[in-house]
Amino acid sequence: APSCPQNVNISGGTFTLSHGWAPGSLLTYSCPQGLYPSPASRLCKSSGQWQTPGATRSLSKAVCKPVRCPAPVSFENGIYTPRLGSYPVGGNVSFECEDGFILRGSPVRQCRPNGMWDGETAVCDNGAGHCPNPGISLGAVRTGFRFGHGDKVRYRCSSNLVLTGSSERECQGNGVWSGTEPICRQPYSYDFPEDVAPALGTSFSHMLGATNPTQKTKESLGRKIQIQRSGHLNLYLLLDCSQSVSENDFLIFKESASLMVDRIFSFEINVSVAIITFASEPKVLMSVLNDNSRDMTEVISSLENANYKDHENGTGTNTYAALNSVYLMMNNQMRLLGMETMAWQEIRHAIILLTDGKSNMGGSPKTAVDHIREILNINQKRNDYLDIYAIGVGKLDVDWRELNELGSKKDGERHAFILQDTKALHQVFEHMLDVSKLTDTICGVGNMSANASDQERTPWHVTIKPKSQETCRGALISDQWVLTAAHCFRDGNDHSLWRVNVGDPKSQWGKEFLIEKAVISPGFDVFAKKNQGILEFYGDDIALLKLAQKVKMSTHARPICLPCTMEANLALRRPQGSTCRDHENELLNKQSVPAHFVALNGSKLNINLKMGVEWTSCAEVVSQEKTMFPNLTDVREVVTDQFLCSGTQEDESPCKGESGGAVFLERRFRFFQVGLVSWGLYNPCLGSADKNSRKRAPRSKVPPPRDFHINLFRMQPWLRQHLGDVLNFLPL
């Protein structure tokens, strides 16, 4: 077969080929940020000629053109400056209102390198309508100027701009406009991952936390966010495998979907996942009717088995057939469960479509969506039961209109996105399901995204200050209790001057809380074994602090999961009859268990907890410590089975001021506290300049570093005695 000519360079940009120079290969241009390629792509035809999708005239030279943002077409009850036909990247537009009108949204907006304006639509409103003035986004024209209950407004975009969002909105009884805000965008514009992740995440969190059907609440503005622990979610992942998707891109589709599956199973909800790949025909790799669809490992393994070559005989993009296979799956499930049953009616459905282009065969995908909406009986009351996310990847031939038509439209949410490439998609899926935004006291959730602050990564972490200086660390285990070390409290019982500093999204310095009461283990006495030549003994080194007020849950403040509780059981996704022993077997399940603690500067440091035989050799080193234990005969007199041991090889050692902080593990994207920092043989911070300086112990140090942490599995009776009405403990 003839190959296509190689004279396809783009001045100022680069290109990639999906299948070399052979027929069927898609050539994709890219330009530096702030520029866009024209044309975006070319397809090598069987004749050996390049064809530009959608082009009417003959092949023109590819060039990188400057990105521009659309200008306002009209701005009501105010003025904007400067008045240009379109705006360059970095250019600003400012808005001011006439007297009697208040500006809502952004007074100044800047054109971003992806051709999208930053900020929010500026609206001059006098608050006269039943619904607020819905505004006119930049580049749009609105018809309809009445904002009473039942009134409708319609939008269209000027010139060659593409509308995403709702072209028609209705003022509802609750004072909220139906649908989602329309945005007019350049056909070549795309979304930045950092904008998509929170938008997608907010919507997804809404869906995951949709109001519990058994709880009758009056209709609130927007959707109530609340983890619904009893609900069921069907998640349908549709992966485009058509010819224009390169094998490498398909791998990233799969990886992104795996990330999604991993995250979704970390929520405390029942979930079934369907996996469908499609090109000319769909292929169902996992159906929600299969029991394995509820098992994360099974779902991920079916994803891993998805093969790019499965679709090599039919390489078109039949989005209709893919969505129709979802419809058929729903239909079968409805017949199985019974149309009128709660079991069927209470299932929430989320479809995520990952595609790189427009459907080019099989009819309009919108028809399949209409069938799906019909079978699920989606109306204003049941709007929460279906979410369709349409994600286009690789600005090339993605059809904004089609994606927008397929994506759900819900107030304050977005469901249709176009990303620049599969790398951006991966980033989005990594960051989108950020449960840490939830206001509920769900435990053990840390923000794992690359741009999260230290406190967002470990939001349970608190600092304890006796007076002005920080002295110890601790962990929130509920919204009012902190777990820490007893040895931090050596000044008798006057805790009136003590403060606990808790993370706060509004302040980088956190928020200080007074202590209502301190419960220090009565068994703790550092001098208990002085007569035996043990100058310091840290048995029972555990304390609980009750804060004077409840902590408001946020991205920066949230409890860690304590093993042996129902809360941790949910997070571990263990069956209901699980015991404390089961948790210990699951969490401390190896000779060397990777764990973490938080450093003085807030960063997360790594250790390995030694178990079984390795615990014995880890603890043995204490016999070399002659200052603290001058005539020690039995190491177990000092290192009782209350302690976990770390500090071998490459482990970091905690500093004195890190005492009381959580020793924790990560499982299924959730964090579990198994110990608390108590004492050690080496202090890496001693005499350092500041919190960021730690010194590694020299290899020749005698004794070598060792660190001992109170093992929470060994403190169960005490924890249950004091927290029995705060946490729900499992049987031992």
Epitope: P466, K467, S468, Q469, E470, T471, C472, R490, D491, V526, F527, L535, E536, L600, T627, M628, C655, K656, G657, S659, N683, C685, L686, G687, S688, A689, D690, K691
Partner: nanobody, 122 residues
Amino acid sequence: QVQLVESGGGLVQPGGSLRLSCAASGHTFRSYYMGWFRQAPGKEREFVASISWTGGSTEYADSVKGRFTISRDNSKNTLYLQMNSLRAEDTAVYYCAADYSGDFLLSDLDSWGQGTLVTVSS
């Protein structure tokens, strides 16, 4: 906050000995880790030795290990530094410090004495 006053510095020959004292006012002395730092002319302040609030554990800088001994007497609210086999490079102003956590981070320490000068010279 603990108030600290050092004493015992002076001129001593190489190989000689000196005992520094640090008197602390405030009933909370017994609950603080205590330490000695020193600062030679034109140099940064450096850690010398520390002792835990219990008196049970001590730490030394490598440069003084085996020559200096830190101790405390909680009944007298006093910290000591016994310095033997002194060398010219031990010449510095010696400061006493109190730290509740025991890390003695220079950026965080708020209880320092005014210092006592030790000169080792023949």
